[in-house]
Amino acid sequence: LEETLLNTKLETADLKWVTFPQVDGQWEELSGLDEEQHSVRTYEVCDVQRAPGQAHWLRTGWVPRRGAVHVYATLRFTMLECLSLPRAGRSCKETFTVFYYESDADTATALTPAWMENPYIKVDTVAAEHLTRKRPGAEATGKVNVKTLRLGPLSKAGFYLAFQDQGACMALLSLHLFYKKCAQLTVNLTRFPETVPRELVVPVAGSCVVDAVPAPGPSPSLYCREDGQWAEQPVTGCSCAPGFEAAEGNTKCRACAQGTFKPLSGEGSCQPCPANSHSNTIGSAVCQCRVGYFRARTDPRGAPCTTPPSAPRSVVSRLNGSSLHLEWSAPLESGGREDLTYALRCRECRPGGSCAPCGGDLTFDPGPRDLVEPWVVVRGLRPDFTYTFEVTALNGVSSLATGPVPFEPVNVTTDREVPPAVSDIRVTRSSPSSLSLAWAVPRAPSGAVLDYEVKYHEKGAEGPSSVRFLKTSENRAELRGLKRGASYLVQVRARSEAGYGPFGQEHHSQTQLDESEGWREQLA
């Protein structure tokens, strides 16, 4: 990018530059016509017969440098060929010299600084590439010369440019003084400000464009070269903030449109809102869940919104004494999640009708909650109680939902309690063919013992056909028809209105070898 300090092509009024010395044949300001056929202010000198060593000077007005360290001067000029000038002396030249003089203010006068090299600083002696020629019988032909010179380094507030003619016939058609600067640049969402290079290369810190944030790593920088070009160098740039995506060739961040979102800063574009969510504003980093839908705390911001599951279905119960096996089917609606678990709530009602949450004497296997399989075994049920189990399905967002959790209930009533096992069997009398047995009356919780069943078999005869049963209403029994001197295993169970209790432990008894021993009372 070029910043103009002076462009005579744009001047409409007389330039009124200073000439030295004030003599005939000096530089003269004239109107000219440029390539675009616009009238321009020019300076012409054509003193080709002057005395050798005599110089004509032309000096511009004071030009503020505006922070530039190096200034460029583009000269457009025409020059007559000495050979085409019949009256040109040996002092005719086809070159001129350019100088500059620095000062902190417009202090130059018609006589100062002295019109010579030092104090003026020589920039270059300029030779014409194209000479205007005239041959007999033909029109004059020529082309405009264009030459760009570099001034500097400059340090004072401004400068004058001066032209020294020592015998040329030439016209200075235009002078363009400018400096080069790196234009404001936006790359990788990073804005680098317009920069005037102070040296060969200058590092320039960038700043993120609106709605962008710095990428990890060193802060973005780019190098501005002396020629006004940014050095092509990879930069760690910026990236669009959440809710914004890169646009217009990575030069700006555009807010995500309604119905789209971008959860993180960085590359990537806005995505449509995931299932069961929406964004009603532009620039959304996250889409809001629809009513009744949620995201778990551990769900990514871009995850779909989910809902608690419906209730489990078809609870099946299998009661076995004081144990209960429950199993069920998965809910129809999982809520869109994989983290499905089950939990049970339990209430128990006593035979008298008073109900309360289940006590701590129940055990659940594998547990009452966080079940991943659709079954549970409940142990420790009390007889003649009615149990209500509510089976609920839960997922990662159940805790976020308000309102009742749907459940599937099942009611189970346990049988009344049977008598306990009969133990402490003792042999009151034995003979070679009989055994008399007695036992303590068990404490039946649900009514009196109605009768007993005695189960016995000869030791060593294990088959079902060898087992014999005897019913008795008393807490004693006589086993007849037994083998002489044989061992028998005996078990007893009691029956109440609730049914038979379990058989007690096997009791080991033996018949007598002969009659002579008679009845012998034995303690079991």
Partner: antibody, heavy 126, light 106 residues
Framework: QVQLVQSGAEVKKPGSSVKVSCKAS????????ISWVRQAPGQGLEWMGR????????NYAQKFQGRVTITADESTSTAYMELSSLRSEDTAVYYC???????????????????WGQGTLVTVSS | DIQMTQSPSSLSASVGDRVTITCRAS??????LNWYQQKPGKAPKLLIY???ILQSGVPSRFSGSGSGTDFTLTISSLQPEDFATYYC????????FGQGTKVEIK
């Protein structure tokens, strides 16, 4: 503003010559084209020729070739037009005119003439 | 030599009229064409050069156009001081004037 001041009216005999001068005042002279244009009474303009003083040589219209000589003196900033073998039909007002731009200061040399002398009446009569 | 033919040779018009004068070259002269205005007893005055460039100080009601062989001078709204004779001039090769167009009051 440049002024072109021409010499006074002339009365000439047929067959003679006339030399009209045109002095430029104020500024550059050498690199402008100076043209000579004549206008017979009640007639149109007629271009005769042109000189660029710095080059010394002139260009002439075919019609006047051999009869007209245009010269310039850079030291006095004066241009001259001499017409020989005068005839009665050469009776006219003779104008010098300077081009709008020097040969060095125009990209397109249209040789348009924006400065004119006041004119010199030359009468050819026996 | 290049011949320049102007038309019409004369025309009558009223103040405020739009006036058009044409000039035709016998061969291509690009845009090396100039227009002059001359009033009786006066030297010509340059109006337009390079076919269409208005000379400094000339009113903008004057305009020129054309390239190659056909050219036009237009006065958009004739003023009392515009009654004069107008000449075209080619400078492509040597120089030649047209025969002139006299603009008179109607």
């Amino acid at each position: 503003q440049v002024q072109l001041v021409q010499s006074g009216a002339e009365v000439k005999k047929p067959g003679s010559s006339v030399k009209v001068s045109c002095k430029a005042s104020g500024g550059t002279f050498s690199t402008y084209a100076i043209s000579w244009v004549r206008q017979a009474p009640g007639q149109g303009l007629e271009w005769m020729g042109r000189i660029i003083p710095i080059f010394g040589t002139a260009n002439y219209a075919q019609k006047f070739q051999g009869r007209v000589t245009i010269t310039a003196d850079e030291s006095t900033s004066t241009a001259y037009m001499e017409l020989s073998s005068l005839r009665s039909e050469d009776t006219a007002v003779y104008y010098c005119a300077r081009s709008s731009y020097t040969i060095l200061t125009t990209y397109y040399n249209y040789n348009a003439m924006d400065n004119w002398g006041q004119g010199t009446l030359v009468t050819v009569s026996s | 030599d290049i011949q320049m033919t102007q038309s019409p040779s004369s025309l009558s018009a009223s103040v405020g009229d739009r006036v058009t004068i044409t000039c035709r070259a016998s061969q291509n002269i690009n845009n090396f064409l100039n227009w002059y205005q001359q009033k009786p007893g006066k030297a010509p005055k340059l109006l337009i050069y390079g076919s269409s460039i208005l000379q400094s100080g000339v009113p903008s009601r004057f305009s020129g156009s054309g390239s190659g062989t056909d050219f036009t001078l237009t006065i958009s709204s004739l003023q009392p001081e515009d009654f004069a004779t107008y000449y075209c001039q080619q400078t492509h090769s040597q120089s030649t004037f047209g025969q002139g167009t006299k603009v008179e009051i109607k």
